[in-house]
Interface confidence: low
């Protein structure tokens, strides 16, 4: 299980990654682009009942497949720094994006990278010293490999392997919300929101203008960035004269709670600062922007509320699919629950279980969601993203079902197609009670742990739970060990 999440000490470094319904109005009342990719991989989104274009696509497909006999497909996304150099990373270097085009496809996947944030001069300086690539484009490699949902291999990405793939590196440290340039007054630029807008503008000249669907995806801070920017992208495209491009969102591990910390701590650094405190400070420091419709719901100075998924989601026009671990490591970190390899105290254990319950509650009215009961952080650009299941359905399958569903503008509960669910939230109550969760390793020994070992390590009370379930403790342990 190489490449899977390891159970590491929190607080050492922030987690970093290595991407219907309210759509923008459309000129031509056009269809969407959900297709059963798992069973028929040709991208029919480019075929509009026109046989000539279909044959051209087949020819293009044949030509593109020809080199495969001699060499492996080039999986790399290539770096393009923004031509508009006034849209910058924190240090004033030009922002950019990595692109891998797929000529036959009218689907575009734009992925926002994650990597925490900084919210004052002190912790931004420290971030610049230790994680410069998250604040500057100066040392970015020329290419990146697409993994998970950014992979062009059908085996690794049964959902959208044939899409045009765009990876937008995170170098604004502002949860993709800022719109303030570097100046004499501001040591750093915070232009996350403007970076997204500028990338979209430049991509229009590279084929995005012919897109049917633009899926704005992101993990961690990038996932929150999706919630903050998806409607603005839709508005931009409509303003620029592309109202028929359907804009959707996919927010992975960016649905945070503004809950009470397990142990209250002063807001000294990024990872110990309570979520609300960090965002309150950040939004002022970044001149952060939030979606207009959400902003209208809160009075001046209260815009920070819109950084929290369950508050901003009901105000969004574009359909958004929410992917969130019920026991998210970043959430636990900011809540001061540090699982340091020692069995947790009872108070922590109850806090963790309650977090799962609270999170489940906030997803109740989210029409499209995938929330496994695992202790982890981020998933969609992990190579193992196809392995995790909720109620027997994998994430790529759920996304495929969502693609086909075209849920309505109010996100009212619509019955999904039989056997094709896309509201998938685990109901079992503790971390890793889902047997398909990413493998856990003991951070000291590097040893893989099975579910039973992990839960006992966490202080799971086998005796009590067995009693509640009306079974022998040994039977419950056996079930857990077998992954049931």
């Amino acid at each position: 299980s190489e490449g899977r999440k390891t159970w590491r000490r929190r607080g050492q470094q922030p987690p970093q990654p290595p991407p219907p319904p309210p759509l923008p109005q459309r000129a031509e009342v056009e269809p969407g682009a959900g297709q059963p990719v798992e069973s028929f991989p040709l991208d029919f989104t480019a075929v509009e009942g026109n046989m000539d274009s279909f044959m051209a696509q087949v020819k293009s497909l044949a030509q593109s497949l020809y080199p495969c006999s001699a060499q492996q497909l080039n999986e790399d996304l290539r770096l393009h720094l923004l031509l508009n150099t006034s849209v910058t990373c924190n240090d004033g270097s030009p922002a950019g994006y990595y692109l891998k085009e797929s000529k036959g496809s009218r689907r575009w996947l734009l992925f926002l990278e994650g990597g925490w944030y900084c919210f004052n001069r002190e912790n931004c300086d420290s971030r610049y010293d230790t994680m410069r690539r998250l604040m500057s484009s100066k040392d970015w490699p020329h290419t990146r490999t697409g993994t998970g949902i950014l992979s062009s291999q059908p085996e690794e990405n049964p959902h959208w392997w044939n899409a045009n793939m765009v990876f937008i590196p995170y170098c604004s440290s502002d949860v993709w919300s800022g719109a303030s340039p570097k100046s004499d007054k501001n040591e750093y630029a915070f232009m996350g929101s403007l970076i997204i807008q500028e990338v979209v503008r430049e991509l229009l000249g590279k084929g995005l203008s012919g897109a049917k669907v633009l899926l704005l995806a992101g993990s961690s801070a990038g996932g929150t960035g999706v919630l903050l920017n998806v409607d603005r992208v839709a508005e931009l495209l409509e303003e620029l004269g592309y109202p028929s491009i359907q804009v959707r969102g996919l927010a992975d591990s960016g649905w945070f709670l503004d809950n009470k910390q397990y142990r209250r701590s002063d807001c000294i650094d990024t990872i110990n600062c309570a979520p609300t405190d960090a965002i309150r400070r950040g939004i002022r420091y970044w001149s952060g922007m939030v979606p207009e419709r959400c902003q209208r719901q809160f009075k001046e100075g209260e815009e920070w509320n819109c950084f929290f998924g369950y508050k901003v989601y009901p105000t969004l026009r574009c359909p958004v699919f929410v992917v969130q671990w019920l026991f998210d490591e970043a959430q636990l970190t900011v809540d001061n629950v540090h699982l340091t390899g020692q069995p947790v105290q009872e108070g922590q254990w109850l806090y963790i279980q309650n977090l799962g319950r609270e999170l489940r509650g906030t997803l109740k009215d989210v029409q499209a969601s995938f929330a496994p009961a695992c202790l982890s952080h981020e998933i969609i650009i992990r190579s193992y993203w196809t392995d995790v299941q909720v109620k027997g359905t994998s994430l790529p399958r759920a996304l495929h079902c969502w693609d086909r569903s075209f849920h309505d503008s109010h996100k009212a509960s619509k019955t999904p197609m039989k056997g094709c669910p896309f509201h998938l939230v685990d109901s079992c109550p503790w971390p890793h009670c889902n047997p398909s969760c990413p493998t856990i390793r003991d951070q000291f020994t590097g040893q893989e742990m099975n579910v039973a070992q992990f839960l006992m390590h966490m202080g799971f009370d086998v005796q009590t739970v067995a009693q509640q379930q009306g079974m022998e403790p040994s039977k419950l342990l056996g079930m857990l060990s077998n992954g049931n």
Partner: antibody
Framework: EVQLVESGGDLVKPGGSLKLSCAAS????????MHWLRQAPEKGLEWVAY????????SYANTMKGRFTISRDNAKKTLSLQMTSLRSEDTAIYYC????????????WGTGTTVTVSS | DIVLTQSPASLVVSLGQRATISCRAS??????????MHWYQQKPGQPPKLLIY???NLESGVPARFSGSGSGTDFTLNIHPVEEGDATTYYC?????????FGSGTKLEIK
């Protein structure tokens, strides 16, 4: 309650003009594309015109192009249809309807306003 | 323009039985797994009311007695069991491309 209410229907002579209005309430009007549709007496439904949420896209049925103009005022939550060079075949009940974000169907309809073109 | 042919023009069904209305498009209205066909009910003196969208999705608040199916060019609206209040006119509409067009309607009578 989500509601659309049309007004402005009247009896008008052939070649005349008329402006129809549609007042929206109960939803964020500025988020939705809007349509005008019509129904001649004892006849079926016919699409007239479409305007996108920000007025960037306007579209008309062929027989109405050049004679009808669709517009909206998001601040006032109103949709309008300016009709000129009216013909007897334009006699109908005119409905405004909200376009659902996905799929192009009409999920909210007004009650209609009657336009009669006759000499 | 895509022409929708609705049949039958009128239909008489016994109370509690099944009513089936068909709609055929001159060109496919399905694409990429979606079928852009919708069904409306219109009672005299009232505007149309959305029943089914995207071929088979029941609009919220509409009784489960109504169901839709089909793809490509052939679509069906089923009402079962039929109730007295269902006696009115039904229209299909496509939104595959502009202009959206409607079928000529089916008048349902209950005996």
């Amino acid at each position: 309650e989500v509601q659309l209410v049309e007004s402005g229907g009247d009896l008008v002579k052939p070649g005349g003009s008329l402006k129809l209005s549609c007042a929206a309430s109960g939803f964020t009007f500025s988020d939705y594309g809007m349509h005008w549709l019509r129904q001649a007496p004892e006849k079926g439904l016919e699409w007239v015109a479409y305007i996108s949420s920000g007025s960037t896209t306007l579209s008309y049925a062929n027989t109405m192009k050049g004679r009808f103009t669709i517009s909206r005022d998001n601040a006032k939550k109103t949709l309008s249809l300016q009709m000129t060079s009216l013909r007897s075949e334009d006699t109908a009940i005119y409905y405004c309807a909200r376009k659902n974000y996905n799929g192009g169907y009409f999920d909210v309809w007004g009650t209609g306003t009657t336009v009669t073109v006759s000499s | 323009d895509i022409v929708l042919t609705q049949s039958p023009a009128s239909l008489v069904v016994s109370l509690g039985q099944r009513a089936t209305i068909s709609c055929r498009a001159s060109k496919s209205v399905s694409e990429s797994g979606y079928s852009y066909m919708h069904w409306y009910q219109q009672k005299p003196g009232q505007p149309p009311k959305l029943l089914i969208y995207l071929a088979s999705n029941l609009e919220s608040g509409v009784p489960a007695r109504f169901s839709g199916s089909g793809s490509g060019t052939d679509f069906t609206l089923n009402i079962h069991p039929v109730e007295e209040g269902d006696a009115t006119t039904y229209y299909c509409q496509h939104s595959r491309v502009l202009p959206p067009t409607f079928g000529s309607g089916t008048k349902l009578e209950i005996k």
